[in-house]
């Protein structure tokens, strides 16, 4: 029953977890306008991984994609890339997990297979987890040298008669749900990891041992016993737990055109 | 066609308060912010503050907070201004002022302060 | 808050001129974030609501003559009529789009001579 928790929770858990990866990769606030030399901007930037936005006065927020490969710092490229990678492994992961639920039954798969599957995916998640945990990490870093960099140079030009700041970008919300994200499926495929454990037959089963009673032929031969799971192989009358395995949709919500500075 | 359809010309004597509207059409409301602006008479414009149609957010030229009160009824497509404390400075045109660029401007309300 | 400043206050011409007035900011109004100026010019005449000309410094309007245009970049920008028209005797405001409070300029009166 534990394992079949374990394995449920891992799953939920890692299903979240990967819908905050998608809409981390989706959306426009990876990096927002450091508001600290102007908190009374009219024109308000962010960008985000595929294109950057500008909301002006007007309430109007016009956004343009990069509509170019080679000419994106290698940096971003790098972040994109393991984001993908992370929702591409996730996804399998989410696959093949389905699969190995322990509440869901599939034909006369062997509970070795499941056991197989569920750490295969509990691999996918962790790995998954880790790329956009890298990816998040990699972009805030990289704003963080741009931050301190547009500072050293903040008032240039004109020597120094005309005011010109330059705009600086600093941590914006897809950072923290990338980060939540990552954590969640990470920890989901630690979680399947350890219910794979559970699920794995252990290699020496019990002999059959014959038992005589005085006054009685009798023999009991109990079937092999898997440690832990609490049923014997020869264990007819399993529980199958329809619906056990629940899809959580998390609403990732964007921030709107019309929330303003 | 968008357009802007402010209320009439208003006479008042020092201290009262006056509430204007700005009807809009032609546009979904809750698109653009919608910003005031007044003209004193011969004078350059001065912009007063503007709100958000969609969350009712506002955001005031530091000049008139305390003056004026922006506010929206997002079923009749409706912004409203109150202006309390009247003087005699405050004699002007308040224009309300919305769409890209600040582009579509109403015809603009007359407010007279005369005791 | 930004300052806006026009030069001349106003002008006499006479129709077929080419004009030129400035408007110069106490700070930039140049956005790196989409490489614009906000920066925007409105016409007015009298008893009227002001008319948007150009929006990020030099953009036209749709539907406002081509004889109109606007240059300039950071804190210095000029509106230029290439050809004044009887219909163009009116009052020219420039305007920061960029910070709150959005401010205009005194406004350049152009007249007939």
């Known amino acids: 029953m534990a394992v079949t928790a374990c394995q449920g929770l891992g799953f939920v858990v890692s299903l979240i977890g990967i819908a905050g990866i998608i809409a981390a990769t989706c959306m426009d606030q990876w990096s927002t306008q450091d508001l600290y030399n102007n908190p009374v901007t009219a024109v308000f930037n962010y960008q985000g991984l595929w294109r950057s936005c500008v909301r002006e006065s007007s309430g109007f927020t016009e956004c343009r994609g990069y509509f170019t490969l080679l000419g994106l710092p290698a940096m971003l490229q790098a972040v994109r890339a393991l984001m993908i990678v992370g929702i591409v492994l996730g996804a399998i992961g989410l696959l093949v997990s389905i699969f190995a639920l322990k509440c869901i039954r599939i034909g006369s798969m062997e509970d070795s297979a499941k056991a197989n599957m569920t750490l295969t995916s509990g691999i996918m998640f962790i790995v998954s987890g880790l790329c956009a945990i890298a990816g998040v990490s990699v972009f805030a870093n990289m704003l963080v040298t741009n931050f301190w960099m547009s500072t050293a140079n903040m008032y240039t030009g004109m020597g120094g008669m005309v005011q010109t700041v330059q705009t600086r970008y600093t941590f914006g919300a897809a950072l923290f749900v990338g980060w939540v994200a990552g954590g969640l499926t990470l920890i989901g495929g630690v979680m399947m990891c350890i219910a794979c454990r559970g699920l794995a037959p252990e290699e020496t089963n019990y002999k059959a041992v014959s038992y005589h009673a005085s006054g009685h032929s009798v023999a009991y031969k109990p079937g092999g016993f898997k440690a832990s799971t609490g049923f014997g192989s020869n264990t007819k009358n399993k529980k199958i737990y329809d619906g056990g395995a629940r899809t959580e949709d998390e609403v990732q919500s964007y921030p709107s055109k019309h929330d303003y500075v | 066609e968008v357009q802007l359809v402010q209320s009439g010309a208003e006479v008042k004597k020092p201290g009262a308060s006056v509430k204007m509207s700005c009807k809009a059409s032609?546009?979904?409301?809750?698109?653009?912010?919608m910003h005031w602006v007044r003209q004193a008479p011969g004078k350059s414009l001065e912009w007063i503050g503007y709100?958000?149609?969609?969350?009712?957010?506002?955001s005031y030229n530091q000049k008139f907070k305390g003056k004026a009160t922006l506010t929206v009824n997002k079923s009749s497509s409706t912004a409203y201004m109150e202006l309390s404390s009247l003087r005699s400075e405050d004699t002007a045109v308040y224009y309300c002022?919305?769409?890209?660029?600040?582009?579509?401007w109403g015809q603009g309300t007359t407010v007279t302060v005369s005791s | 808050d930004i300052v806006m400043t026009q030069s001349p206050s106003s002008l006499s011409v006479s129709v077929g001129d080419r004009v030129t007035m400035t408007c110069k900011s106490s700070?930039?109004?140049?956005?790196?974030?989409?490489?614009?100026?906000?920066l925007t010019w409105y016409q007015q005449k009298p008893g009227k609501a002001p008319k948007l000309l150009i929006y990020?410094?030099?953009t036209r309007e749709s539907g406002v003559p081509d004889r109109f245009s606007g240059s300039g970049s950071g804190t210095d920008f000029t509106l230029t009529i290439s050809s004044v028209q009887p219909e163009d005797f009116a009052t020219y405001f420039c305007?920061?789009?960029?910070?709150?409070?959005?401010?205009f300029g005194g406004g350049t009166k152009l007249e007939i001579k």
């Open positions: 032609g546009y979904t409301f809750t698109d653009y912010n």
């Open positions: 990020w410094a030099s």
């Open positions: 305007q920061n789009d960029y910070s709150y409070p959005l401010t």
């Open positions: 002022v919305t769409t890209r660029y600040l582009a579509v």
């Open positions: 709100i958000n149609p969609n969350n009712g957010g506002t």
């Open positions: 700070q930039s109004l140049f956005n790196s974030g989409n490489q614009k100026n906000y």
